[in-house]
């Protein structure tokens, strides 16, 4: 199809060689009320037709993306040629940075419903450059964490070294939707909830004497709980004595709850106390039996092939520890009567 009638947008992706980042292109086809630009070669902006023929943005999952080879070859279907680029509804996701992503990307509706729609397309000229200036050493990361329940902020990586006063107007998107009230280089969140997690995009315009570009950066925001201030607690065993039958096999389970820690090195082990002696027991691997955002429940069993008289004189101790501290629970075996 003829792409000369497509509207054109220029975008710049300056990526950091230090970090993994993603990038997105939105298929910015016009909404029905603005759709006259799709067929501007037929109508002036004032001559809006009685029924607007373009399908509008509510059906933008049905768009086709192409790349225009620089050598003038025919347009290539993105899905067939570029495994590191994913189409999700009307968004094109670039999973890896690199100058080889530079080029022209075209999107248009899959369903051409009227002659007007033929020219309803957007051509995005993407320039990709590695970040060169080391002047801004502490630029914001493309992966930012927000602490649940507290105040936080999301910074636009490409503008994070500029003060709010000198920052240009920024357009923000969250999960592909425009955040119309946000115009600064930083989004301030008064209280962080789970729904603040997502993919944020910040755009601003950079102009020179020749042309203007949209500078875009993508930020993956996740909401996290703060590191626990508590040592782990033992959920099982609860009792400090356990009735057993001599000569029978026995499994004692130790289950402990560990609060969230970004650097998580839990310890859960069994040891035996016998009068003045104490030794660690070789037991099966610890395993997580529940995993939530706030805590991890880990279980470790001690297995006795058969309970002996000697075992009744011993204490079996479960020891659990995180970076805050440790907790123990001891169990004394008692012969079952009758």
């Amino acid at each position: 199809f003829n792409i000369s009638g497509c509207s054109t947008k220029k975008l710049l992706w300056t990526y950091s060689t230090r970090s993994e980042e993603e990038f997105v292109l939105f298929c910015d086809l016009p909404e029905p009320q603005k759709s006259h630009f799709c067929h501007r070669n037929r109508l002036s902006p004032k001559q809006v037709p009685e029924h607007l023929p373009f399908m509008g943005s509510n059906d933008l999952s049905d768009v086709q993306w192409y790349q225009q080879p620089s050598n003038g070859d025919p347009l290539e279907d993105i899905r067939k040629s570029y495994p590191h680029i994913i189409q999700d509804k009307c968004t094109l996701h670039f999973l890896t940075p690199g100058v080889n992503n530079s080029g022209s990307y075209i999107c248009r509706p899959k369903m051409i419903k009227s002659p007007y729609d033929v020219a309803c397309c957007v051509k995005m000229i993407l320039e990709v450059k590695p970040q060169t200036n080391a002047s801004c050493e502490y630029s914001a990361s493309h992966k930012q964490d927000l602490l649940l329940g507290s105040t936080g902020s999301i910074s636009c990586p490409s503008l994070s070294c500029q003060s709010d006063a000198q920052s240009p107007a920024v357009t923000w998107y969250k999960n592909g939707k425009l955040l119309s009230v946000e115009r600064s280089n930083r989004i301030v969140v008064d209280e962080v909830y789970d729904y603040h997690q997502g993919t944020y995009v910040c755009d601003y315009t950079q102009s020179d004497t020749v042309s203007s570009w949209t500078v875009r950066a993508v930020v993956q925001v996740r909401t996290i709980v703060g590191d626990t201030k508590l040592k782990p607690d033992i959920l099982d065993p609860v009792e400090d004595t356990l009735e057993v039958e001599l000569g029978k096999p026995l499994t004692i389970s130790c289950k402990a709850r560990f609060g969230f820690e970004r650097v998580f090195n839990p310890v859960i082990k069994w040891y035996i106390k016998d009068s003045d002696l104490e030794w660690e027991v070789s037991v099966p691997e610890a395993k997580s039996i529940k995993s939530t955002l706030k805590d991890e429940i880990i279980e470790r069993n001690i297995i006795l092939e058969k309970v002996t008289q000697r075992d009744l004189r011993r204490k079996f101790v479960c020891f659990v520890q995180n970076s805050i501290g440790n907790t123990t629970q001891s169990v004394q075996l008692k012969e079952k009567r009758g």
Partner: nanobody, 115 residues
Framework: DVQLQESGGGLVQAGGSLRLSCAAS????????MGWYRQAPGKQRELVAD???????NYADSVKGRFTIFRDTAANTVTLQMNNLKPDDTAVYYC?????????WGQGTQVTVSS
């Protein structure tokens, strides 16, 4: 830090078999969930199969009866036995574990099924 190392990918003809393995290191316990996802060119990452501690398994409809997942809790490994492979199974296969309700991923291993 948790590291996930996949192996066993490769090129195979339709109807053939492959066995993918993944070992988790840098972790002192067996994670709640271990499993496999895959991503075909231009598509979203999707679940293939996973297994929770205690043994319950979950398979994508498209692989049921053809793929089998195994876990070795002591060694912190997860294995995917893939039989009767189809061209549609061509993708990068990623090992996946869950800690604090969040996913960690391996680098991926390419599986290509030719017709």
């Amino acid at each position: 830090d948790v590291q996930l190392q996949e192996s066993g990918g490769g090129l195979v003809q339709a109807g053939g078999s492959l066995r993918l393995s993944c070992a988790a290191s840098g972790i002192t316990f067996s994670p709640y969930v271990m499993g496999w996802y895959r991503q075909a060119p231009g598509k979203q990452r999707e679940l293939v199969a996973d297994m929770v501690n205690g043994g319950s398994t979950n398979y994508a409809d498209s692989v049921k009866g053809r793929f089998t997942i195994f876990r070795d809790t002591a060694a912190n490994t997860v294995t995917l036995q893939m039989n009767n492979l189809k061209p549609d199974d061509t993708a990068v296969y990623y090992c996946h574990i869950m800690i604090f309700g969040r996913a960690s991923w391996g680098q991926g291993t390419q599986v290509t099924v030719s017709s």
